[in-house]
């Protein structure tokens, strides 16, 4: 859960909030307390944001985009309090923003700050392009330009792709990573330095499995404790690659509970996702069950993929009918 | 302290044009509305404009929209009451008056002295 | 526009006296009410707002009264350097309107 927003203090009347995309912000404001109070917020020294005096709003000449956005704390005023309640900011609201106060005792003017971050939360994918195997971390909307690391065995990897794409909003960005062949974990790091906000994806190749037609495997599923937190809504997805793409077998969301089985031979034990341990089994093991198995652990601060890959054998019998 | 001081009356033809000023001091200019306040020889007051703090907001007297022009000139701390097609009616003391903040109150805290226009043929 | 109107026009009153001055508006205008003093020769000065408030340094017998349509100037005793045109002043909206005054004299 983050803060509406959160203030840094900087000399000459002049403090900073941090807000984010869509969100609610407090721009702050506060003068000694006296009748007749007059305020006046503006955007740049030019927009109009919001207007009160003689006891209420005037906003018929409030600029269109504040319309319906902005709104004091009413209640609040002959105390003191002249901040401005701020709605859905957008990356346009970032710039600075005066407040003017006037009351029977003085004049007042402070300044502050808007910056505006966006931080959608990222994805780590793995994904086969022919022969290669690929992570891609990616993140759909961020602002400002974020920080990207890679690192191969906790070692960070100087070699780092970045595909940018820029919007009005913000900037759409994919780091891939081409890990064919490799056995090595790999982590990815993307740091939004406005929000003080960091998200890491994780990718572990867990030893190839060779099981004969009919068994059960049981495949092991467990976050590191570095980034796991249990009071964190995450959610486990398991799934298996069938010709390049996957398809989901199982889901677990740790707000409701819930787990959601969509192949029948698939089984989860209640008693270890208890423990935050979600390995999986499969039951009566088929030709057809060879393949790279994915378990993805993911919450809003970080992704975990452990890839199992498991070889199904004919069994004697069935060799020996053919 | 606060001073106000008005500039620029005279006689004037009707048709003719007028400008007036107001050299304020003693507070910060800036941050304050200014109003031009009138008062015909022997009569009432009668509010004629006035200009917000920044001079972005100005507002006029049905008596003279359209007429006059007031502007301010905060690195300098002066107001201006630019008067077009004046009319007889327009003879008046003209004061410049402080708003209590902004403009937006609409009352007037300190005055000029005023300077006297008279429109006559 | 807002109508203001005074009584009386004129008032004749003497040192020591209670002095009330009433001014009308012709519409309500909450309590968005000024009372100034205008000496002769002089500019005005504010000595009431916001219907009751005084001014820093006026004195103390000055007060004001009233909300709505009607108001109140009263001078709770009448001293001699109150010789003086008295003029109520809605600000409640554009254009501001002043009442027409009323003119106190001491006997």
């Known amino acids: 859960i983050f803060p509406l927003a959160f203030f840094i203090y900087v000399p000459m009347n002049e403090q900073i909030v941090i807000g984010r995309l869509d969100e609610d912000i407090i721009l702050p404001s506060s003068f000694e307390r006296g009748s007749e109070v007059v305020i006046h917020w503006k955007y740049q020294d030019s927009y109009k944001v919001h207007s009160y005096y003689k006891g209420s709003d005037h906003l018929e000449s409030q600029d269109p985009r504040y319309a319906n956005r902005t709104s004091l704390f009413y209640n609040e005023i002959q105390n003191g309090n002249a901040s401005l309640f701020f709605r859905r900011v957008s990356l346009l609201d970032e710039g600075i923003y005066t407040c003017y106060v006037g009351t029977a005792i003085q004049v007042i003017t402070n300044k502050v700050v808007l910056k505006v971050g966006v931080f959608l939360t990222p994805v780590m994918k793995y994904e086969k392009r022919n022969t290669n195997s690929f992570l891609i971390c990616s993140v759909l909307s961020v602002y400002p330009r974020p920080i990207i690391t890679w690192k191969m065995d906790n070692t960070p990897i100087s070699e780092n792709n970045m595909e940018e794409t820029g919007s009005l909003d913000s900037f759409s960005i994919n780091s891939p990573l081409n890990i064919t062949g490799s056995n090595s974990s790999y982590e990815c790091t993307i740091e939004n330095s406005l929000l003080k906000q960091t998200w890491t994806g994780r990718w572990t190749m867990k030893d190839g499995l060779h099981k004969m037609q009919s068994e059960h495997v049981s495949l092991s599923c467990q976050p590191v404790n570095d980034y796991f937190s249990p009071n964190q809504d995450f959610k486990v997805t398991w799934s298996r690659m069938k010709s390049g793409t996957f398809s989901v077998l199982a889901y677990y969301l740790s707000s409701s509970q819930n787990t959601i089985i969509n192949e029948s031979r698939f089984s989860w034990n209640k008693e270890l996702i208890n423990q935050s341990d979600f390995s999986m089994n499969l039951m009566d093991l088929n030709l057809s069950d060879s393949g790279e198995y994915l378990c993805n652990i993911s919450s809003d601060e970080y992704t975990l993929l452990t890839i199992h890959t498991v070889h199904v054998e004919p069994s004697q019998e069935t060799a020996s009918h053919n | 302290q606060v001073q106000l001081v008005e500039s620029g009356g005279g006689v004037v033809q009707p048709g003719r044009s007028l400008r007036l000023s107001c050299a304020a001091s003693?507070?910060?200019?800036?941050?304050?509305?200014i109003h031009w306040v009138r008062q015909a020889p022997g009569k009432g007051l009668e509010w004629v404009a006035v200009i917000w703090y920044e001079g972005s907001d100005k507002y006029y007297a049905d008596s003279v929209r359209g007429r006059f022009t007031i502007s301010r000139d905060n690195s300098k701390n002066t107001l201006s009451l630019q008067m077009n097609s004046l009319r007889v009616e327009d003879t008046a003391v003209y004061y410049c008056?402080?708003?209590?903040?902004?403009?937006?109150?609409?009352?007037?805290?300190?005055w000029g002295q005023g300077t006297l226009v008279t429109v006559s043929s | 526009d807002i109508q203001m109107t005074q009584s009386p026009s004129t008032l004749s009153a003497s040192v020591g006296d209670r002095v009330t001055i009433t001014c009308r508006a012709s519409q309500s205008i909450s309590s968005w009410l000024a009372w100034y003093q205008q000496k002769p020769g002089k500019a005005p000065k504010l000595l009431i707002y916001k219907a009751s408030s005084l001014e820093s340094g006026v004195p103390s017998r000055f007060s004001g009264s009233g909300s709505g349509t009607e108001f109140t100037l009263t001078i709770s005793s009448l001293q001699p350097d109150d010789l003086a045109t008295y003029y109520c002043q809605q600000y409640n909206s554009y254009s501001y309107t002043f009442g027409q005054g009323t003119k106190l004299e001491i006997k």
């Open positions: 008056a402080r708003d209590r903040s902004s403009g937006a109150m609409g009352y007037f805290v300190y």
């Open positions: 003693g507070f910060t200019f800036s941050d304050y509305g």
